[in-house]
């Protein structure tokens, strides 16, 4: 039962970085991507602000929170319509995630 | 550090509901997922269910139909029903927080447990 | 339903010894197994967490591996403190499930 290479376990994500040069010189692009491999009944999230597989019950339902989507310490708050959440750190600065 | 305190009667009649609480002090209960899990006496550990910030949970379908799992955010509680009781459900029960270890959910911390009876 | 299983039901061993407990899954649950520690009159404790990693103050004596359906927890160099009853966990699916035990005591 071992992982080949490149594989992902069951359940798991991992961050992918993607690197390319621009036709500007001296210009590197540099962005970020999620590669998951989520079980049957769930569905790539954000848990503790990563990438992660949740209940698919979650996203069905907008119960955006239910994936523990902040770090830890920080309230999690749905926005309006359930169009995303907001997590809200002791200091009071506030982060906001839409949903599209 | 994040403490669990169950608390609810100690006896219960067959055939009525048990009812237990669990407070969380030294956290917010907003931030985790919640559990009950039980012990008959001389056996080992059955998971009851958990539940979800929103008040959504997940059951154990041998209870499912007798169970329900609720949250009070406001009092940082959350609380165990279980109706039509018989002796079969004596047992310790114990809440516990549920982490997310990246992608591996535990049970971290445990309430110290509560001793319920079934007996006439 | 996912079963659990662990080998043996009990253990005896003595202070300083080296000892394996070993849990099946009666389906592959990837890494997604927990490991408990119980003694008597306490709550479980949780010592580790997708199988294998350690959880936070819990001593380096003890280790787990495995993946799949096979799983081990190990607990190199026995202190007394260590007798108790060890539980693992699958944490892969609903309802989540227990093996039933494995007791180790004092020879």
């Known amino acids: 039962q071992f992982l080949k290479e490149g594989q992902l376990a069951a359940g798991t994500c991992e961050i992918v970085t993607l690197d390319r040069d621009s036709s500007q010189p001296r210009i590197e692009e540099r962005s970020q991507t999620a590669r998951c491999a989520c079980r049957k009944g769930q569905i790539a999230g954000t848990t503790r602000a990563r990438p992660a597989c949740v209940d698919a019950r979650i996203i069905k339902t907008k119960q955006w929170c239910d994936m523990l989507p902040c770090l830890e310490g920080e309230g999690c708050d749905l926005l309006i319509n359930r169009s995303g959440w907001t997590c809200t750190q002791p200091g009071g600065r506030i982060k906001t995630t839409t949903v599209s | 550090q994040v403490q669990l305190q169950e608390s609810g009667p100690g006896l219960v009649k067959p055939s009525e509901t048990l009812s237990l609480t669990c407070t969380v002090s030294g956290g917010s209960i907003s931030s985790y997922y919640w559990s009950w899990i039980r012990q008959p006496p001389g056996k080992g550990l059955e998971w009851i269910g958990y539940i979800y910030p929103s008040g959504s949970t997940n059951y154990n379908p041998s209870l499912k139909s007798r169970v329900t799992i609720s949250v009070d955010t406001s009092k940082n509680q959350f609380s165990l029903n279980l109706k039509s009781v018989t002796a079969v459900d004596t047992a310790v029960y114990y809440c516990a927080r549920v982490n997310p270890f990246g992608y591996y959910y535990a049970m971290d911390v445990w309430g110290q447990g509560t001793t319920v009876t079934v007996s006439s | 339903d996912i079963q659990m299983t662990q080998s043996p039901s009990s253990l005896s061993a003595s202070v300083g010894d080296r000892i394996t407990i070993s849990c099946r899954a009666s389906?592959?649950?990837?890494?997604?197994l927990n490991w408990y520690q119980q003694t008597p009159g306490k709550a479980p404790r949780l010592l580790i967490y997708g199988a294998s990693t350690l959880q936070s103050g819990v001593p380096s004596r003890f280790s787990g591996g495995g993946s799949g359906t096979d799983f081990s927890l190990t607990i190199t160099s026995l202190q007394p403190e260590d007798f108790a009853t060890y539980y693992c966990q699958e944490s892969a699916s609903i309802p989540r499930t227990f093996g039933q035990g494995t007791k180790l005591d004092i020879k």
């Open positions: 389906q592959s649950i990837s890494t997604s």
